[in-house]
Amino acid sequence: QGWQAFRNDATEVIPGLGEYPEPPPENNQTMNRAENGGRPPHHPYDAKDVSEYSCRELHYTRFLTDGPCRSAKPVTELVCSGQCGPARLLPNAIGRVKWWRPNGPDFRCIPDRYRAQRVQLLCPGGAAPRSRKVRLVASCKCKRLTRFHNQSELKDFGPETARPQKGRKPRPGARGAKANQAELENAY
């Protein structure tokens, strides 16, 4: 299963059915701290720190759409979110040239298991209801990511994913200089 198959919006089920939004911005004060209950107990990894949070399942309940048609009932979906912390990158610098090098393998919070659910879609204008089978995320895991997964495969994981490798400068042209700098500053 290629990394491209995993999407943070966790829909990737039926082309045309409405997609889920990205998880809301994470706030250090309101996040689900491990000592405050954390996430459901089946999660494999628990990261606890002022800045590193664990891979967890966010629940979204919303209607699915397919063109003008909409699901008769809202569907509860899981979205995998969070870090498989702690940070495994260290700053390196020679003169004014900065890059990141790893101090451990990179893991990503991605879907682990899926479940199938049949959804009835109601269409306007008296059209007959449609029935569709959708594939929904059932659980998440911290999965190893390697530098050999190319940039296009990484794009669904957000800006912090495409990091320079050990002992290498950021690839020229991969992102703007400002974007690269922001990435370095926010990587932890």
């Epitope: 990261a47 590193e52 912390g85 940070a87 495994r88 451990g104 911290c142």
Partner: antibody
């Protein structure tokens, strides 16, 4: 030579806590996360978690959630693992370990291990 | 968690024998499989990483193969110092997990 030297054996009563130390030498301590692995008598190896000495951020195996705390002291290049609410099945040898890296294969492995600290939990 | 199942759990062999230990993962772990050797009272020592890469200094009689879920450690000609317990470990998904071990004893 890269070395990890751990504290001595401990005997604890059920419900107590234990804090094991691991002093690193021969490399820059903050360059690698420190991992902890335990081994119950006659049993296999069990990964407990890791800590980043730079940020102090730690990640724990869910099995130990709420009972384990990993910390580091960068001034002495020492990592600590505290396990609370000890039970008899926590009787084990506790190892600290550091990863090694192969740049060609982009792969990591437990390369350097401490000598182990025996923790016995008995009433 | 990914379960790592080693077989056999123990075996008896003689010096010079060819020994094969298998490790099966409960799900695909690509090539993120390491092998360790442990002797009584000692910490584990890495032998092979990334399924088949021999750590520098490890004798060439040790070899590893496999991919996905099924992996093998082979000792082509068992030496007296090879009598020990061998563990596989996956590095694909957190938490890292180890096999239950295979004890290689003298026949």
């Amino acid at each position: 030579e890269v070395q990890l030297v751990q504290s001595g054996a401990e005997v604890k009563k059920p419900g107590a806590s234990v804090k094991v130390s691991c002093k690193a030498s021969g490399y820059t301590f903050t360059d690698y996360n420190m991992h902890w692995v335990r081994q119950a008598p006659g049993q296999g190896l069990e990964w407990m978690g890791e800590i980043n000495p730079n940020s102090g951020g730690a990640g724990y195996n869910q099995k130990f959630k709420g009972r384990v705390t990993m910390t580091t002291d960068t001034s002495t290049s020492t990592a600590y693992m505290e396990l609370r609410s000890l039970r008899s099945d926590d009787t084990a040898v506790y190892y600290c370990a550091r990863l090694g890296y192969d740049d060609i294969y982009d792969d990591w492995y437990f390369h350097v291990w401490g000598q182990g600290t025996t923790v016995t939990v008995s009433s | 968690d990914i379960q790592m199942t080693q077989s056999p759990s123990s075996l008896s062999a003689s010096v010079g024998d060819r020994v094969t230990i298998t490790c099966r993962a409960s799900q695909d772990i690509s090539n993120y499989l390491n092998w360790y050797q442990q002797k009584p009272g000692k910490a584990p020592k890495l032998l092979i990483y990334h399924t088949s890469r021999l750590l520098s200094g490890v004798p060439s009689r040790f070899s590893g193969s496999g991919s996905g879920t099924d992996f093998t450690l082979t000792i082509s000609s068992l030496q007296p110092e090879d009598f020990a317990t061998y563990y596989c470990q996956q590095g694909d998904t957190l938490p890292y997990t180890f096999g239950g071990g295979t004890k290689v004893e003298i026949k």
